[in-house]
């Protein structure tokens, strides 16, 4: 679940069996120059960053309700 | 590597209270939540909490909410379990328990701390 | 709080044989199960993860499946040191829980 930092694909690899209670927030890169696939980096209650799969759908639940959460904020 | 201490066993007077103590190191002790679990002899295991050491964030259990108080020092990266007015119901194996940061799973585990409660 | 039903709550099996233990969610659990080995007088130890995610250092013999309420843990080619007791645990909502147990013996 390493993150990278140049400008190229971000995720060397995702997690899984990621959990959302320790996400404080989800950053959804859509495919654009640098990278051709879509990344999603969630950032950790300590801090960290954890690359997680997009396809997964627990990801993608995790995705809609952090979104949710933002637009009722 | 990770490694979880708990303090030695206690034999303690019904009504009184018990402070027992989970040293962590081989790692950054203030980014898990540790978990507490209970296992009365002969019985499963209970969930009582937890509590992040970072911003000292706690989950309890409703059934511990009066009977635990779980508190944590960074300095010393031990994390704490206070179990109050005591009675025989207590008398338990306690055990302490980091929660990985991504995925919540326990991983690692103390050695466990009994507790007997007795007059 | 979500109720975990483990089953058997004894088991006893013959050396290189196989063993499955079954553990019902009260409500659906998104697959966060885990599954823990238990000897007296130590801590638990973390087998699997996330339904089939096996801990490093697991052998594996060790194999989870399941999804929505029902979850199942299998151990194949039983080996003198997998005598214990084995504990579902739900990771979904606090309060986490876990199954009742299953002891394992050798026959």
């Known amino acids: 679940a390493s993150v990278a930092t140049e400008l190229r694909c971000q995720c060397l690899q995702t997690l899984q069996g990621i959990h959302p209670k320790n996400i404080q927030s989800v950053n959804v890169k859509s495919p654009g120059p640098h990278c051709a696939q879509t990344e999603v980096i969630a950032t950790l209650k300590n801090g960290r960053k954890a690359c997680l799969n997009p396809a997964s759908p627990i990801v993608k639940k995790i995705i809609e309700k952090m979104l949710n959460s933002d637009k009722s904020n | 590597q990770v490694q979880l201490q708990q303090s030695g066993a206690e034999l303690v007077r019904p009504g009184s209270s018990v402070k027992i103590s989970c040293k962590a190191s081989?790692?950054?002790?203030?980014?898990?939540?540790m978990n507490w679990v209970k296992q009365r002899p002969g019985q499963g295991l209970e969930w009582i909490g937890q509590?992040?050491?970072?911003?000292?964030?706690?989950n309890y259990n409703a059934k511990f909410k009066g009977k635990g108080t779980l508190t944590a020092d960074k300095s010393s990266s031990t994390a704490y379990m206070q179990l109050n007015s005591l009675t025989s119901e207590d008398s338990a194996v306690y055990f302490c328990?980091?929660?990985?940061?991504?995925?919540?799973?326990?991983?690692?585990w103390g050695q466990g701390t009994s507790v007997t409660v007795s007059s | 709080d979500i109720q975990m039903t483990q089953s058997p709550s004894s088991l006893s099996a013959s050396l290189g044989g196989k063993v499955t233990i079954t553990c019902k969610a009260s409500?659906?659990?998104?697959?966060?199960i885990a599954w823990f080995q238990h000897k007296p007088g130590k801590g638990p130890r973390l087998v699997i993860h996330?339904?089939?995610i096996l801990q490093p250092g697991i052998p594996s013999r060790f194999s989870g499946v399941g999804s929505g309420r029902d979850y199942s843990f299998s151990i194949r080619n039983l080996e003198p040191e997998d005598i214990a007791t084995y504990y579902c645990?739900?990771?979904?909502?606090?309060?986490?829980?876990f199954g009742g147990g299953t002891k394992l013996e050798i026959k």
């Open positions: 409500q659906d659990i998104n697959k966060y």
């Open positions: 081989g790692y950054a002790f203030s980014d898990y939540w």
């Open positions: 645990l739900q990771y979904d909502n606090l309060p986490w829980t």
């Open positions: 328990a980091r929660e990985r940061d991504y995925d919540v799973a326990m991983d690692y």
């Open positions: 996330y339904t089939s």
């Open positions: 509590i992040y050491p970072g911003d000292a964030d706690t």
